[in-house]
Interface confidence: low
């Protein structure tokens, strides 16, 4: 556990007066309807709020929307609806905010039935001004910005056309028809699937995967018989129909689709699916659904090529395609992921990995908690985390687990303590060491958020009654203060703080209800005066991540290196500040066999860390043979785990084997590829 100096709770001095001076109410001149909020840029303080209200008339529904803008983190709002000509904005498209600090915003308007195309409002100055543009098509999807150039937009039309703009939506060009799915890749590349015989649904499994690297001037067919495709890290994946039956296989490319290799993963049938759970430039977590309507599958982790996969976790909970999985990347500590498994008795249990999927284990029972009714042994049980699946099942869980990269080690989640997830009302738990140890933080369900890179945690009780109290902690959830932010309770709808957890402002959203009307209201609280001074060197302490045995020289080694962080002392009440950068000191570890995975043609017998050659590859066929190459497949049986930085120590290099003789069956023969220009 990260060091916690003060066990007793000291009160933050004069906090009521300090917070009262920094609490800003804004009542919106709106009927209730719905509200959506977007931050424009990073550290700009600009927030856009769109309220929409549908008035059902006898013959049709009349829509009204209003647009508000704040440039002080939500303390004050100005009605800017006139900038969009009082047009009704379609909420299903949301507000398309440009990448980075481009200051770009696109709003999609509702247009009357007979119009030739849709209408958008565009801003490139953080929503100070908007330009109305009529589209030559009706958009089916929200405008998608190229990650590399915010002037480049793409959208699909209701007629399945792929439209591209090179000047931030001023002019549009249809670059391809019959398009099912389109995504930006790197370097302004667009990948998309097309159908030939009628529709996306009818042609599923017979789609073609296309690429354009010049915004539609020229195209290249990079795959046929495609079911779907996805991008993750530097990997491009496609699931491809097999020649002879209805099964599909994953193929992977690391060169934008010029060349492909068959991933060493099981094929799936019509009712099954693949899902990329997480991906970075090193590796991929892939879920492969089990046959039948089981609700679970297997997680596999890839090598650095995305080709060779190791089984990581069995019975991984993932309901139908596009359904729910609890898979969560704990962003506050490297290598940590949490998810749920469906056990044989159909109970759901939480598992955690600290080494990027190498090993999974149950979460340690919090020391200040009792085992609940699900536990067979009242002294031995685990913490089980509520995530997307629990929320989808309408359990009393208002929020998914929360972690932030700049709040090192902190994980906050709803959970229950027992042998499995309980349907009883959950409590909120916190870990300050990336999931190794846990403490009950708050009794009952809450909304929560992290401010000032972990310097403040804010929470609001999840209640069906109106609320007027907020809780906050300056010591990573050990001690809590309560502040009454308004005399008149509101029906709470959400907490909003600037993404990135660097802000010290929190906005509480809700509505007031009186006999005749209900109105949107927000309260923005600035905690800057609670954290009166800037943090100094003495406020930080050294913390070794992943430390489980301080006596061990290799303590803290994960994926070949250990990291020491400077962590804010729990007892220090000071500002990390907006410019806070996580300070870490990495050191390389000696290699052990744990730093290597088994290459194709090799496996690890249970409870053995050595890779042993498979007797023959007949059952696995040629998919292990890289790039479809029928020769020169050499391996020493080991391959370093992606992202592993170990040096020295164990070097499992052995006699190099030539595996070409085991590659016996024929590959699907490449046919002529299609390239064309517009």
């Amino acid at each position: 556990s990260a060091p916690g100096e003060d066990e007793e709770c000291g009160r933050v001095r004069d906090f009521v007066a300090k917070l009262a001076n920094n609490t800003h109410q804004h009542v919106f001149d709106d009927l209730r309807g719905s509200v959506s909020l977007s931050w424009v840029g990073d550290s700009t303080g600009v927030i856009l709020v769109l309220t929409t209200f549908h008035v059902p008339l006898v013959i049709m529904t009349f829509g009204q929307s209003k647009l508000y803008r704040s440039e002080d983190y939500g303390k004050n709002f100005k009605d800017i609806t006139d900038l969009i000509n009082n047009t009704f904005i379609r909420t299903e498209f949301g507000m398309a905010i440009g990448p980075e600090n481009s200051g770009k915003v696109v709003l999609t308007a509702e247009v009357s039935g007979g119009s030739r195309g849709g209408r958008i409002f565009r801003s490139s100055d953080f929503a100070k001004n908007f330009v109305q543009t009529d589209l030559p098509f009706h958009p089916l999807t929200q405008m998608m910005y190229s990650p590399q150039n915010s002037d480049y937009l793409l959208a699909l039309s209701t007629e399945n056309g792929l439209w591209v703009s090179k000047n931030f939506g001023g002019k549009w060009e249809e670059i391809h028809k019959a398009v099912c799915l389109a995504k930006w890749g790197s370097d302004n590349t667009i990948f998309f699937t097309t159908y030939a015989n009628g529709s996306c649904k009818a042609d599923l499994g017979a789609l073609e995967l296309w690429r354009t690297s010049d915004l539609g001037k020229s195209f290249k067919t990079i795959g046929v018989k495609i079911y779907s495709f996805g991008l993750g890290g530097r990997f491009l994946f496609a699931s491809v129909m097999a020649d002879k039956d209805t099964t599909r296989r994953i193929h992977v490319s690391t060169d934008q689709g010029d060349t492909w290799s068959m991933a060493q993963l099981p094929s799936v049938g019509q009712e099954q699916f693949y899902s990329i759970l997480a991906a970075n430039d090193d590796m991929v977590f892939m879920h492969v659904d089990e046959p039948g309507d089981t609700g679970f599958g297997t997680i596999f982790t890839s090598d650095d090529r995305g080709i060779v996969y190791s089984k990581s976790l069995d019975r991984h909970l993932y309901t139908t395609t596009g359904g729910e999985t609890d898979f969560t990347n704990v962003t506050s500590l490297r290598g940590v992921y949490i998810t749920s498994v469906l056990s044989e008795d159909n109970s759901i249990q939480t598992m955690i990995t600290f080494d990027q999927g190498g090993r999974w284990t149950h979460l340690r029972k919090p020391e200040n908690s009792e085992c609940d009714a699900t536990a067979k042994n009242k002294n031995e049980c685990s913490l089980h985390i509520h995530a997307s699946y629990s929320i989808s099942q309408k359990l009393n869980v208002p929020m998914a687990p929360l972690s932030e990269p700049n709040a090192v080690g902190i994980v906050i989640a709803h959970g229950s303590v027992g042998d499995a997830i309980s349907v009883m009302v959950p409590d909120v738990y916190i870990s300050d060491d990336g999931g190794y140890s846990w403490t009950k933080m708050l009794e009952g369900p809450h909304y929560y958020t992290i401010l000032d890179s972990g310097g403040i945690i804010v929470a609001i009780e999840h209640s069906s009654r109106p609320i007027n109290v907020i809780k906050f902690s300056t010591d990573e959830g050990q001690c809590w203060q309560t502040y009454t932010f308004t005399r008149d309770p509101i029906y709470f709808t959400g907490l909003a703080s600037e993404p990135g957890a660097r802000s010290m402002n929190i906005s509480i959203w809700g509505f007031t209800e009186s006999f005749l009307t209900s109105q949107w209201v927000s309260y923005t609280i600035d905690f800057k005066d609670i954290l009166e001074r800037n943090c100094e060197e003495k406020d930080y302490t050294i913390w070794l991540a992943h430390s489980t045995d301080p006596e061990d020289y290799e303590d803290g080694c994960i994926l070949g290196y250990k990291e020491q962080f400077l962590r804010l002392r729990k007892s220090s009440v000071c500002q990390n500040g907006r410019d806070y950068v996580v300070t870490k000191q990495p050191s390389i570890c000696l290699c052990s066999l744990e730093d290597f995975l088994c290459d194709f043609g090799y496996y690890r017998p249970e409870n053995d860390s050595k890779c042993v050659e498979q007797p023959e590859l007949k059952g696995h066929d040629l998919e292990f043979c890289l790039y479809g190459r029928e020769e020169h497949l050499t391996t020493n049986g080991y391959r370093k785990i992606p992202g592993d930085k170990c040096q020295g120590g164990v070097n499992p290099v052995r006699e190099v084997k030539d595996l070409k003789k085991k590659c016996t069956s024929n590959f699907l023969s490449p046919e002529k590829q299609n390239s064309k220009s517009n």
Epitope: G223, T259, W260, E630, P670, Q673
Partner: antibody, heavy 129, light 107 residues
């Protein structure tokens, strides 16, 4: 513009090793495979092998298996070809060549061969006692 | 490995005439074939890829055709700078292999 610049001529005795470098510029190094091709005096072209700069994975012609090692340094956009246990018949000009389509893939209709579109100037290696 | 055979070994042609070079593969290479031109003391230069697509900057007098095992490179009207050695190369299956070359000389 796109260029491949190779290291200078080398003279080696039989049994020794030689390491030829090929520095790429003018394009994204990790996007293209690199092939090595050699040409003995008065003879035709002979493909030796290929390297994928992203992961460093390689594939060698059977004839050179065990004697050739291809590596890359992404920080300097350079690929290297080392040939060991040299014999007199290894006297040749060694070329690196950018190979956009890289290694054949098990993916139906996924590739048309693009050819080795950019070549280095060649490095003469002379093996003589 | 796939063996590539080029014919003829030498082709004598007058400037302005048409030259037809053949390349045969020992097994199908689909359209995974390229043609290169090499002049004395120089590195090879890519002419044709995908059996029939001209590489960037290659004049229209060069054309490629064929698929499977039989391929042809045609130079419609030979210019003085076209006298060189021409190689075909397959990339259907590793190892990549080249033909023995056809030398086009001035008649």
């Amino acid at each position: 513009q796109v260029r491949l610049v190779q290291s200078g001529a080398e003279v080696r005795k039989p049994g020794a090793s030689v390491k030829v470098s090929c520095k790429a510029s003018g394009y994204t190094f990790t996007k293209y495979y690199m092939s090595w091709v050699r040409q003995a005096p008065g003879q035709g072209l002979e493909w030796m092998g290929i390297i994928n700069p992203i992961g460093g994975s390689t594939s060698y012609a059977q004839k050179f298996q065990g004697r050739v090692t291809m590596t890359r340094d992404t920080s300097t956009s350079t690929v290297y070809m080392e040939l060991s246990s040299l014999r007199s018949e290894d006297t040749a000009v060694y070329y690196c060549a950018r190979d956009p389509s890289g290694i054949a893939a098990a993916f139906p209709a996924s590739r048309s061969y693009y050819g080795m579109d950019v070549w280095g100037q060649g490095t003469t290696v002379t093996v003589s006692s | 490995e796939i063996v590539m055979t080029q014919s003829p070994a030498t082709l004598s042609v007058s400037p302005g005439e048409r030259a037809t070079l053949s390349c045969r593969a020992s097994q199908s290479v689909s359209s995974n074939l390229a043609w290169y031109q090499q002049k004395p003391g120089q590195a090879p230069r890519l002419l044709i890829y995908g059996a029939s697509t001209r590489a960037t900057g290659i004049p229209a007098r060069f054309s490629g055709s064929g698929s499977g095992t039989e391929f042809t490179l045609t130079i419609s009207s030979l210019q003085s700078e076209d006298f060189a050695v021409y190689y075909c190369q397959q990339a259907r299956l590793g190892p990549w292999t080249f033909g023995g070359g056809t030398k086009v000389e001035i008649k």
